[in-house]
């Protein structure tokens, strides 16, 4: 009876020490997508609508505040896109790019993690125009860094949840 | 305040080419798209094409394709518009208009015509 | 290549009177609607833009509504001075216009 106890307290302990663990999936805010031709930093976004939710991670200013020291797997997905219903591209050669940036404000300091892109070109020709970025990675994340997003080109920016989105999870200590 | 001043009316032969000119002021002439839009006497508006002012980067309408040619100064701050191979079918009230999109904002050419020039009437006729 | 019709082609109401054109695209264009103001010898205006946008300067009697392939011009109170011929626009297509005349 006491191994089972034991076991059931040590179930309760993991179980709640998962549920202590930080993550984060935060969707683009479509209302609120900046304007710009050249790399602007996306700030608005939603963490409890949707798909979008947050745990033991802190959003704000448009950044995403690390509250736990931790090895983090961070990800984010950005698509492009343009209809000819929107009007026409004003050049056809495009640099389609995101950056994920790490920003630390005890030792002031900004770092870019990953980036992901491609230069495209977009004919006029065509009604529709896509494309997809994917960057993810594993990284040392310490108490009060923030983690941000730039892209190029804001105005071809899906605004939907399953095509714009970033996110982070922490997968273990740091010994 | 922005203007948009065309150059006067012209009266040409069929065969021959007129050049329209649109001198911008009030704006940053280089942030912006100039787009050419007729009237015939009796129709409707016609959409020819359009000139991003900042790179020169032209569109036009598949009916003007190959007798059309639009072309900016940027120091003049100016927009031309040269139609070729005219017919008597060209006879139409001429228009620039800019377009609301700023290039510094965002790359789409949004065909929203905020300020039109006051128009130039060309007439072609034997 | 989307086809834009108005109607009617021509109308004639009262001073005070509530006036709606109606523009109908061949398909879907979202929002990407815009209505001009013409009057002969005069540069164009531009009155809204992205189906319900007022452009800066235009009295608040005009408005617009609607999405997807069927658009509204609504002008509340027709004055003397909105005699003129009104296009819808989506893109490089042009409605055929509504000539509005007082009675």
């Known amino acids: 009876e006491k191994a089972m106890v034991d076991g059931s307290w040590l179930d309760l302990a993991k179980r709640s020490k998962l549920e202590a663990q930080p993550f984060a999936h935060l969707t683009i805010n479509a209302t609120d997508i900046p304007s710009g031709s050249h790399k602007v930093s996306l700030s608005s976004w939603y963490h409890d609508r949707g798909w979008a939710k947050i745990s033991n991670m802190t959003f704000s200013n448009g950044k995403l505040i690390v509250n736990q020291d931790g090895f983090y797997y961070l990800y984010a997905n950005i698509c492009f896109r343009h209809h000819e219903t929107s009007g026409d591209l004003a050049t056809e050669y495009l640099q389609l790019m995101v950056y994920v940036t790490k920003t630390s404000i005890k030792i002031p300091s900004s770092h870019t993690l990953m980036k992901g892109g491609s230069t495209k070109y977009w004919s006029g020709n065509s009604e529709f125009h896509f494309y997809s970025i994917n960057v993810g990675g594993f990284f040392k994340l310490r108490s009060g860094e923030e983690i941000s997003i730039e892209v190029s080109n804001p105005s071809l920016l899906d605004p939907d949840q399953d095509a714009t989105y970033f996110g982070a999870f922490k997968v273990r200590d740091i010994d | 305040q922005v203007q948009l001043v065309q150059s006067g009316a012209e009266v040409r032969k069929p065969g021959a080419s007129v050049k329209v000119s649109c001198k911008a002021s009030g704006y940053d002439f280089s942030n912006y798209a100039i787009h050419w839009v007729r009237q015939a006497p009796g129709q409707r508006l016609e959409w020819m094409g359009w000139i991003n002012a900042g790179n020169g980067n032209t569109k036009f309408s598949q009916k003007f394709q190959g007798r059309i040619t639009v072309t900016r100064d940027t120091a003049a701050s100016t927009a031309y518009m040269e139609l070729r191979s005219l017919r008597s079918e060209d006879t139409a009230v001429y228009y620039c208009?800019?377009?609301?999109?700023?290039?510094?904002?965002?790359?789409?050419?949004?065909?929203?015509?905020?300020?039109w020039g006051q128009g130039t009437l060309v007439t072609v006729s034997s | 290549e989307i086809v834009m019709t108005q109607s009617p082609s021509s109308l004639s109401a009262s001073v005070g009177d509530r006036v709606t054109i109606t523009c109908r695209a061949s398909?879907?264009?979202?929002?990407?609607l815009n209505w001009y103001q013409l009057k002969p010898g005069k540069a164009p205006r531009l009155l809204i833009y992205g189906a319900s946008s007022l452009q800066s300067g235009v009295p608040s009697r005009f408005s617009g509504s609607g999405s997807g392939a069927e658009f509204t011009l609504t002008i509340s109170s027709l004055q003397p001075e909105d005699i003129a011929t009104y296009y819808c626009?989506?893109?490089?297509?042009f409605g055929q216009g509504t000539k509005v005349e007082i009675k």
């Open positions: 398909q879907s264009i979202s929002r990407y």
């Open positions: 626009q989506h893109t490089r297509a």
């Open positions: 208009a800019r377009d609301l999109s700023n290039m510094v904002r965002g790359i789409i050419i949004a065909y929203y015509f905020d300020y």
